[in-house]
């Protein structure tokens, strides 16, 4: 029995609902009484949801899953996963048994956009050209881990003297803090770009130092 799932991962934002698509081709005369459907976590074989003996057996996964009962007879075995969490990320196996049996695995990629970075400067007063300053770029509650890029006002990448740390909170979302140590010129703009590699979403922050005063656009 050929079971079909999308080749590409399903991308779902944290807190939203995701549909894990799975389909099979029912033969003529097929009835739901013949169908045995199992969704499970691929790596641990933990049962997620099942359908057997003509009945939805319900969710075994925190009561956040549902089938599409009206579409099962047409060969649609997709699973709805509600209120997606970081911990849901991974591979789900769809097993279908009628007379023959088969299975396929679909990957769920969880994502969350990063907040607009906040910029801080240390020291933040009495700055002169030639002073060494520490610029911190902070962005919050994103997933997966971010890519961080720094550049100056002319768009030239700044790669030296950058330290980036990412810490996951209890929900598995990352807070990113990137520190740039730089020697001030006469004036200058320093930009931080926090990129979510899954969403291809960029969050920008910048600070402009013009002797006095400083501005934080």
């Amino acid at each position: 029995l050929e079971v079909q799932v999308p080749e590409d991962p399903v991308v779902a934002l944290v807190g939203t609902d995701a549909t894990l698509c799975c389909s099979f081709s029912p033969e003529p005369g097929f009835s739901l009484a013949q169908l045995n459907l199992i969704w499970q976590l691929t790596d641990t074989k933990q049962l997620v949801h099942s359908f057997a003996e003509g009945q939805d057996q319900g969710s075994a996964y925190a009561n956040r899953t549902a089938l599409f009962p009206d579409l099962l007879a047409q060969g649609n075995a997709s699973l709805r996963l509600q209120r997606v969490r970081v911990a849901d990320e991974g591979s789900f196996t769809c097993f279908v048994s009628i007379r023959d049996f088969g299975s396929a695995a679909v990957s769920l990629q969880v994502a969350a956009p990063y907040s607009k970075p906040s910029m801080t400067l240390e020291p933040n007063k009495d700055l002169r050209p030639g002073d060494t300053v520490t610029i911190t770029c902070s962005s919050y509650r994103g997933y997966p881990e971010a890519e961080v890029f720094w550049q100056d006002g002319q768009g030239v990448p700044l790669t030296g003297n950058v330290t980036t740390s990412q810490m996951a909170n209890e929900q598995g979302l990352f807070d990113v803090h990137s520190v740039l140590r730089v020697v001030l010129g006469a004036n200058g703009t320093y930009s931080c770009l926090v990129r979510n590699p899954v969403l291809q979403q960029d969050a920008h922050g910048s600070v402009t130092i013009t002797g006095q005063p400083m501005t934080f656009p």
Partner: antibody
């Protein structure tokens, strides 16, 4: 039609490592299947050794876990068994088998290969 | 000694019906699917029943499976001499390990 074929030395010395390979033909080792090793000592019953998924996830028989490693080679479309510190009690016919993920059953088996542990 | 037990042997005449039992516990059969395998002399096991009671394509309906609680049963009707073989039940336990019964030798009486 998917087929499995075991290969490896038929004789292994005590304390050495038993190494077997299972070649998958007519299908891909990267499909939605778990790949298992099962053995059967002469005149005795079946004993499951362990399994692997193409992602690298493994499960092992607790009684053999400390001595067993199962690996998968996607480029060669095969998976392997390594059982170290063997004794004569490891003498058996070794089978590789497929479990379609979710089926909880082994629907395709290799023909088996006899491995004798003796000095 | 297997944690899943089967009778060592059963026998019946051709055309008769025979059942083979498989007894386990809540940590294996009680909470997992049972499969059944036929092993003819000198050959690899062959899947007869999966998911407690389902037959793969090509397996005649003379073979049936059932499960109740922590026990499972394989039934064979219309016994044929070609059915003479060893039969194994298989299941899984809570540690994600497959477990086989000790096997039952079926003799078809001439």
């Amino acid at each position: 039609q998917l087929q499995l074929q075991e290969s490896g030395p038929g004789l292994v010395k005590p304390s050495e490592t038993l190494s077997l390979t299972c070649a998958v033909s007519g299908g891909s080792v990267s499909s939605s299947n778990w790949w298992s090793w099962v053995r059967q000592p002469p005149g005795k019953g079946l004993e499951w050794i362990g399994e692997i998924y193409h992602s690298g996830s493994t499960n092992y028989n607790p009684s053999l876990k400390s001595r067993v490693t199962i690996s998968v080679d996607k480029s060669k479309n095969q998976f392997s068994l390594h059982l170290n510190s063997v004794t004569p009690e490891d003498t058996a016919v070794y089978y590789c088998a497929r479990e379609v993920a979710g089926s909880a059953a082994f629907d395709i088996w290799g023909q088996g290969t006899m491995v004798t542990v003796s000095s | 000694q297997s944690v899943v037990t089967q009778p060592p042997s059963v026998s019946a005449a051709p055309g008769q019906k025979v059942t083979i039992s498989c007894s386990g516990s809540s940590s294996n059969i009680g909470n997992n699917y049972v499969s059944w395998y036929q092993q003819l002399p000198g050959t690899a096991p062959k899947l007869l029943i999966y998911g407690n009671n389902k037959r793969p394509s090509g397996i005649p309906d003379r073979f049936s499976g059932s499960k109740s609680g922590t026990s499972a049963t394989l039934g064979i009707t219309g016994l044929q001499t070609g059915d003479e073989a060893d039969y194994y039940c298989g299941t899984w336990d809570s540690s994600l390990s497959a477990v086989f019964g000790g096997g039952t030798q079926l003799t078809v009486l001439a």
